[in-house]
Structures are given as structure tokens and as C-alpha cells.
Interface confidence: low
């Protein structure tokens, strides 16, 4: 068959599977006169043979792992054995079959992992090799965990990268591994060739012993510190420790206090630096941070809680310079006159703020001293000896000592003797009729005026009238304000009226005095009045459950992710349709029925966070009334902005020729968020070809110095490419260009002959 299995002498390549016994010839070369025979040379390995007539074949199975390519040469000879054609290269490519099993480099691996390590971060690699061709499935290895011992609640704490053999913690492992419970684990790992996909794959296993080490980066127990300490400061109160030596510790005050009285040293010991005052602040919460030598946080911050313990450093204080009470003449012994309530700034419900009351003086002492008692702990004043007479003594003044366990304070009480309360308030009418109001009547509206009168002594507690709604308004929608001069009552709306829950309310008022009635006198029907409130329906707009809805997501969430939801109800029970208003960036969509909010485009914290939109709830049907609420989407940062130059650096120049190597300083920035630390950029030259002329050296996390390595520069502009890496997750890199001109200078400035004025650098170095 001319062409496929036979033909003239020319360079050719053949592919033959290894491991197969010969079953057919490779090729039949045809001789062109004067050629009569053929000769084979090269890497024949005594396997490849050519018969004189040009029949190329092999005589036994090939082995790719011994030789993957046989480079042969075929020449055509004339009758005298002289080469007349060729030699031409003949390449035999040996195709792989899966005839080698993978083998682990070690039969046993050992490693350790710290509890709470980041999931997915490799802490150990297992490695296997397979002699088969890695470009084919035969040599493509697939790693798997066969078993984890112990296995708790059927949860895998470890995972392996099927391709690389990297062993790391799962999320559950990161959260649950605890050396106190289980200090060691054993994994049996298998490796299969054929990418693990074939029943005919070969495999090997290895054993991995893993020690779990304690994570000592833990928040300490809450600390109690006594206020106003007189001990020398600073005083060590607690400590944190990073897992390895060399960490740099700092404290972060999230509350941004004007005075932050704590510090930390480089051992991780935390100190209070000055006396604390519980009455100024009774507890502190701040954070301890551990950073590496470059200022990068090593882990999450730890929360430190300090509770300030009270001492008795505050005396009792009186409620006012003089406290005034009223007592009716002829009141009975033991009646309550009023309660003196003093205060103490020390901690509530402790001995430091527990107060005692004692009357130390009564003036006048008429008709005798000791007319009043005060309850030692409650501060309630009572009539002690006899009824009082206004015409004898219309006013008494008491001096009362109020004490805690260490301090005493004097408070002053004035007691006015008033006429007896033997008259009840009488309503001018007992029924104020019907009143019809729409349910959307404004809160604060006065809807009714009521009036009762009392014949007791004017402007005393015996004649003052307090109006109460005792029936018909369990929701507290109405209230009554009293004019103290006229005792007129103004009925006002305190909460929205609601047709749906209370269409008709039968309201009953009671008029009372703050002073008790004398013995034998009782309130009767004259002190009660009623009216009927009829509420009419108004189609009301839907009501949101909150004025502002907030949600927080990472700025890199996938399109279509649910980022929040809002809820509203219609008072009339109609269905609600939700929509968005003010989505200027086109980032969001809302499910009209459920109120769930989804992202529909990539979010970007750097464009502004929080992102504020309005959500609208509209009745379906009815009069389509709508309400508006706010939705605030707080975007959490991911590292998605490469570093760049902080400003425009055009116009940098050196005076030519350089008398000595020179340098200039530049600054980098990026738009991502940098919590607990500033940016921490690393700098390098953007290409290897620059290294003969320039070097770049880091000054700090944001600044670097570009220096010349020699003085032999041409008089022209050089564009120096700088690579800036932000070390983030993922690390992002920016390549920036610094244009530097070497020019002749006059008085320290670049000199250009007339006509060459464009782009003159303006900054000399």
C-alpha cells in the first residue's frame, strides 16, 4: 500500500506503543536506482532491523521507560555498498502504556499542624512518582485520603489536594481540632495513576502521622481592675502570646477613647498605665494584635475585656437642694408623706451605694419634736405622732442625713401642711358623646377637652386633678394632659389610631387627686365620665418593619448572591410588591414578592461603602399606596486593587554627567482597605535588564528609593519600570514607570536649547 506502509526514502516519524509484541512491519522503503540496498544505524538497541530490500521492522516489545524516542538513520547503498541516498532521520516515538505503578517517596510521613490554622493552607506534602508519561493519564497522579483516625462524628478534619498532595485542614478541622482532646491523627493516603479515573489504575498507599499543636494565641480571661489604684503604674493585668517568638505586639482601641490607659510590651504582657475611674468608664474592650517583622498581622486580633471594680469613692447626693412634700391636716398616723430618693454614683446594688436615711433635725419643733419618721433604707417619710394643724404650723423643715458605708450627706425636705382632701373632683358632664376620627389623624392632636372641678384648697394636691383613662384604651393610643391652673384636661392622640384593630372604643375617664381622700370620703360616679371614639378606615400605605435595613457582604460576592432582604406589611392585608429606587450603580435587584435583594453586577467597595438605595413597598391592588425605607449594603474589602504610584512623577532628572551615583524617593499606594496596619508594599525592578543600571530599595511599607548603580548614563530619558507587590490575599502587583531624564544643567535645572522645550523635567535629583 503505497504511502502508508511503503514509499521512497525520506525523513519520517513513527509512533509505536510500548509493551506490544511486533505484529506488523513499520515501513517498506523503495529503492531508486542506482540504490539497491538499505542500511540502518543509530539507536537500534538491537530491536530495530532493516532488511536489505528496505523492510523496516522491530523484533521485540519496546519499553518507553528505557528509551522514549529512538533516533535512527536509514541510508540507500549502491551495488558497491556506497551511500547514494541519505542517510535520512527516522524517528520512532514510543507511546506510553500504563505499565508502572505510582510509588510514594516515603512509606511514612510525619507533620504537625497548629489548631485553628487557616483551612486550605497546606502544612504537609506527600509525594509519589510514576515512571509512566506524565503527559498522559498513565502518569497523572491522583491523591486521596483513604481514612482518618480517629474520625469523630464522621467529620473529616483534613483534606488533600488531589493533584499536588498538599494536606491541609478542612473548615471543620480549623474550628474543632483540639490537642487537649486528640493530640494526634493518622491518615492513610492513596495515590492512583490514570488520574484516579480508571478501574485499571495502579495505586500505592502511605501513612501520615499528624501532631496537633496548641494554638496559644487565645483571648485571656476577662480582667478585673480596682478603680483608683494607688499602686505604682504601669501594672501588668494580663498577657497574650503568639505561637512563635519574634512577634510584634500592639493594642487597638476600637472605641477611639480620648484616654486609652493600656499598653503592651514585646513579650505580650498587657499593662494598665494609670488609675481607672469606674464612674467614668466601668469596662473596656480592646484588641491585641500580633504582627510579623514586616508589620503584617499574623492572625486575627484578640479581644481583651477589662472590668473596673468599684470602690466607695462617691458620697450620696440629694435629688434637689430642697425636696417639697405635702401633708393634709388631720392625716392619720403612719400615712406616707413622700419618699426622699438620694443617689450614689458608686456601683448599683452594692454596699458602696446602699443608702441609710436618718432625720437629724425638725424645725419648728411644734407642737413637739419627732413628728416625722423616715424609713431607714427606703427613704419614705411618714407621720409619726399626731395629725397636723395648718393654722398652728403651715410648714416644717427637715434635715435628713443620707449615708453609705463611708460618707454622709445632709438633704433638706420642706413639708407643707395643706387643707384636708374632703372634696372629690366632679366632672362638668358625665358623657362627652361620640367623636368620629379618621385613623390617620396626627399624633399629638387634641381631640377633646374635659373638665372637672374640686372644691379643696386651690393649688394643693387636694384640689389638683389628674385624669386617667381607666377603660377602653388598652393599647394606650390616647393620653390626657392637665392644665395645672385650670384643671382642664386635653385628650390627645399618643399612638396611631387603627380602624383594623379598634373601630369603636368606649372610653372611661377618672378624675383623681394626687393627695389621698380623708377617711370616709370616696370617689363616686361624679368623678367618672365617658365618651365614644369612632375610627374611620383610611387606606394606609404598607409599613416596613425597619426604617433602615442593613446587610454586610464581601465586595467580591458572586453575581446572583442574596445580599439582604426587607419586609413590609400592609395594614389592610393586601399583597405587597417590592422595588428598588436609587440603584445608581445598577448593582442590585429585588424579588418583587419576597423582598430578597440580590447582586446583579460586580460590587466594588472602593466605589463607595455603604451603598445606599431605597426600597419601595407598594400595595398590589387597592390604591397602590407605597412606602419607602433605606437599604444600606456594607461592602467588606478584598484585595482587588494593585499598587500604583501615589502621585505624578513626571519631571524627575539628574544633571548630566553624573558626578556620583544619585537616588530619588517615590511613594506607592493602593485603594484597598488596610486594617490594623498601613500598606506593606515590596518593590523590585520591573525587568532584569534594568539591574545593571538601577537598584530599588525599600524604605518602609509605602516608600522606596531608586538609585543609580554607576555614573555612565547617556544624556537622554530612561523609563525605569518598578514592580510593586502589595503582599495581600491574593498578592496583587502593579508595574509602574518612573521616567528619569539625564540632562545638561544650568544652575541646577535642565538646559534645553530653544526649540527643545517640550517635556522639560522640573525636579532635579
Amino acid at each position: 500500500q503505497e504511502g502508508k506502509f511503503s514509499g521512497p526514502l525520506k525523513p519520517m516519524t513513527f509512533s509505536i506503543y510500548e509493551g506490544q509484541e511486533p505484529s506488523q512491519i513499520i515501513f517498506q522503503f523503495k529503492a531508486n536506482p542506482p540504490a539497491v540496498t538499505f542500511e540502518l544505524t543509530g539507536e537500534t538497541d538491537n530491536i530495530f532491523v532493516i532488511e536489505r530490500e528496505g523492510l523496516l521492522y522491530y523484533n521485540r516489545a519496546l519499553d518507553r521507560e528505557t528509551r522514549s524516542t529512538h533516533n535512527l538513520q536509514v541510508a540507500a547503498l549502491d551495488a558497491n555498498g556506497i551511500i547514494v541516498e541519505g542517510p535520512v532521520p527516522i524517528t520512532i516515538k514510543v507511546k506510553d502504556i500504563n505499565d508502572n505503578r505510582p510509588t510514594f517517596l516515603q512509606s511514612k510521613y510525619e507533620g504537625s499542624v497548629r489548631q485553628n490554622s487557616r483551612p486550605g493552607k497546606p502544612f504537609l506534602y506527600v509525594n509519589a512518582t510514576d515512571l509512566d508519561d506524565p503527559a498522559t493519564p498513565n502518569g497523572q497522579l491522583y491523591y486521596q485520603i483513604v481514612i482518618q483516625l480517629p474520625m469523630i462524628n464522621n467529620v473529616m478534619y483534613f483534606q488533600i489536594n488531589n493533584k499536588t498532595g498538599a494536606i491541609s485542614l478542612t473548615r471543620e478541622g480549623s474550628q474543632e481540632l483540639n490537642p487537649a482532646k486528640n493530640p494526634s491523627y493518622n491518615l492513610v493516603i492513596s495515590v492512583k495513576d490514570m488520574g484516579g479515573q480508571s478501574e485499571n489504575s495502579f495505586s500505592d498507599t502511605t501513612s501520615v502521622d499528624i501532631i496537633v499543636t496548641e494554638n496559644i494565641w487565645k483571648a485571656p480571661k476577662p480582667v478585673e481592675m480596682v478603680e483608683n489604684s494607688t499602686d505604682p503604674h504601669p501594672i501588668k493585668i494580663t498577657q497574650v502570646r503568639w505561637n512563635d517568638p519574634g512577634a510584634q505586639y500592639s493594642l487597638v482601641d476600637k472605641e477611639k477613647l480620648p484616654r486609652f490607659p493600656f499598653s503592651i510590651d514585646q513579650e505580650g504582657d498587657i499593662y494598665v498605665t494609670q488609675p481607672l475611674d469606674r464612674e467614668e468608664k466601668d469596662a473596656y474592650v480592646f484588641y491585641a494584635v500580633a504582627k510579623d517583622e514586616y508589620g503584617k498581622p499574623l492572625s486575627y486580633p484578640l479581644e481583651i475585656h477589662v472590668k473596673v471594680k468599684d470602690i466607695n469613692d462617691n458620697p450620696p447626693t440629694c435629688p434637689s437642694p430642697v425636696t417639697v412634700f405635702e401633708v393634709q391636716e388631720n392625716e392619720r398616723l403612719g400615712n406616707s408623706i413622700g419618699t426622699l430618693t438620694a443617689h450614689d454614683r458608686d456601683e448599683e446594688n452594692t454596699a458602696n451605694s446602699f443608702l441609710n436615711y436618718r432625720i437629724v433635725e425638725q424645725t419648728p419643733k411644734l407642737p413637739m419634736d419627732g413628728l416625722f419618721l423616715i424609713q431607714t433604707y427606703a427613704g419614705m417619710l411618714q407621720l409619726a405622732k399626731q395629725s397636723l394643724k395648718k393654722q398652728d404650723t403651715p410648714q416644717y423643715n427637715l434635715t435628713i442625713e443620707v449615708s453609705d458605708k463611708d460618707f454622709k450627706t445632709l438633704c433638706f425636705v420642706q413639708i407643707n401642711v395643706i387643707d384636708i382632701n374632703d372634696q372629690i373632683p366632679i366632672f362638668e358632664k358625665s358623657d362627652y358623646g361620640n367623636l368620629t376620627l379618621a385613623e390617620d389623624t396626627n399624633i399629638g392632636s387634641t381631640i377633646l377637652t374635659i373638665q372637672a372641678t374640686d372644691a379643696d384648697e386651690p393649688f394643693t394636691g387636694s384640689s389638683k386633678i389628674l385624669y386617667h383613662i381607666i377603660k377602653g384604651d388598652s393599647e394606650g393610643r390616647l393620653g390626657v394632659d392637665t392644665d395645672p391652673h385650670t384643671n382642664t384636661g386635653y385628650v390627645i392622640i399618643k399612638k396611631p389610631l387603627d380602624f383594623e384593630t379598634a373601630a369603636v372604643s368606649n372610653i372611661v375617664f377618672k378624675a383623681e387627686n394626687p393627695e389621698p381622700l380623708v377617711f370616709g370620703v370616696k370617689y363616686n360616679a361624679s368623678s367618672f365620665a365617658k365618651f365614644t371614639l369612632i375610627v374611620t378606615d383610611v387606606n394606609e400605605a404598607p409599613q416596613f418593619s425597619q426604617h433602615v435595613f442593613q446587610a454586610k457582604v464581601s465586595e467580591d460576592v458572586a453575581i446572583g448572591t442574596k445580599v439582604g432582604n426587607v419586609t413590609a406589611k400592609d395594614p389592610e392585608g393586601l399583597d405587597i410588591s417590592y422595588s428598588l429606587r436609587g440603584d445608581t450603580r445598577g448593582w442590585l435587584k429585588i424579588d418583587h414578592v419576597t423582598g430578597e435583594i440580590f447582586s446583579v453586577a460586580p460590587l466594588d467597595r472602593e466605589a463607595g461603602s455603604p451603598y445606599r438605595v431605597q426600597v419601595v413597598a407598594t400595595e398590589v391592588g387597592g390604591s397602590s399606596l407605597s412606602s419607602v425605607s433605606e437599604f444600606h449594603l456594607i461592602l467588606m474589602d478584598v484585595n482587588d486593587n494593585p499598587p500604583r504610584l501615589a502621585k505624578d512623577y513626571t519631571g524627575l532628572f539628574f544633571c548630566h554627567p553624573l558626578s556620583a551615583p544619585g537616588s530619588l524617593i517615590f511613594e506607592a499606594t493602593d485603594d484597598d482597605q488596610h486594617l490594623f496596619r498601613g500598606p506593606h508594599f515590596t518593590f523590585s525592578l520591573g525587568s532584569g535588564s534594568l539591574q545593571n543600571d538601577w537598584e530599588v530599595s525599600k524604605i518602609n511599607g509605602t516608600h522606596a528609593r531608586l538609585s543609580t548603580r554607576h555614573t555612565e548614563f547617556e544624556e537622554r530619558e530612561y523609563v525605569v519600570l518598578i514592580r510593586i507587590n502589595d503582599g495581600g490575599r491574593p498578592p496583587l502587583e502593579g508595574i509602574v514607570s518612573l521616567p528619569v531624564t539625564f540632562c545638561s544643567c544650568v544652575e541646577g535645572s535642565c538646559f534645553r536649547p530653544a526649540g527643545h522645550q517640550t517635556g522639560i523635567p522640573t525636579v532635579g535629583m
Epitope: 493533584k163 458572586a558 460586580p602 482587588d640 490575599r729
Partner: nanobody, 124 residues
Framework: EVQLLESGGGLVQPGGSLRLSCAVS????????MGWFRQAPGKEREFVAR????????RYADSVKGRFTISRDNAKNTVYLQMNSLRPEDTAVYYC?????????????????WGQGTQVTVSS
């Protein structure tokens, strides 16, 4: 389980362009960081480009920077590699890969799902 299917390879002259596509099935593409790798004959598989779940972060090998662009359309469950100014040394089998680690835009070299590959040949 997630499966990846590459397409768009072929023969192109130096300086020409190709656009590779990687269709993701079995799961939503937006759950995965995605990458393109390539393997030239007789060489190890090498990283070409990768893109985060949202498409917000892209990374490239130095050898393709400025010529290749990786992008994704999560609505279509597809990742693309636009290859311009192709050179003979770009000849390789191009593989699409998925990184299912739970980190959003964090990349380890943890690509754990691979496609079968598509051949790209740059030759005059």
C-alpha cells in the same frame, strides 16, 4: 460534580488571535476561581492566567501579560481566554481548571478540577 470542557483551539499564524472557552457544568461557575494552564510537548504544565469567583481579580504569567486576557461570564457558566499576538512558543495544549477553595478571591495553587485540554498550534 463539576466538569470542564474547553473549546476554541486550533492552528493560527504568528501574530494571530484565538479565543478559548471553558464551559462549566455540574455546578455554578461562580462558586469557583478559574484558571488556564498549558503544557507544551516535552514540558511541564505551566500556569497561564486565573480569575477570581467574581471576576474582580485576575493574575497572569509574565510570559503572557499584555497579550492574553482572562474573563468570565457567570450567567453563561463560561470562562474565556482571549489570546492576541500569538507566538510559536505559545503552542501547547491549554487546560481549563477550577479552584473550589472557600476563599472567594484567595488563590492557592489548589486547582482541583481539570478539563481535557484543547490544542493550540502557532505556526506559519
Amino acid at each position: 460534580e463539576v466538569q470542564l470542557l474547553e473549546s476554541g483551539g486550533g492552528l493560527v499564524q504568528p501574530g494571530g488571535s484565538l479565543r478559548l472557552s471553558c464551559a462549566v457544568s455540574g455546578r455554578t461557575a461562580s462558586e469557583y476561581g478559574m484558571g488556564w494552564f498549558r503544557q507544551a510537548p516535552g514540558k511541564e504544565r505551566e500556569f497561564v492566567a486565573r480569575i477570581s469567583t467574581s471576576g474582580g481579580v485576575t493574575r497572569y504569567a509574565d510570559s503572557v501579560k499584555g497579550r492574553f486576557t482572562i474573563s468570565r461570564d457567570n450567567a453563561k457558566n463560561t470562562v474565556y481566554l482571549q489570546m492576541n499576538s500569538l507566538r510559536p512558543e505559545d503552542t501547547a495544549v491549554y487546560y481549563c481548571a477550577a479552584d473550589g477553595l472557600p476563599y472567594g478571591d484567595w488563590f492557592g495553587d489548589q486547582f482541583d478540577v481539570w478539563g481535557q485540554g484543547t490544542q493550540v498550534t502557532v505556526s506559519s
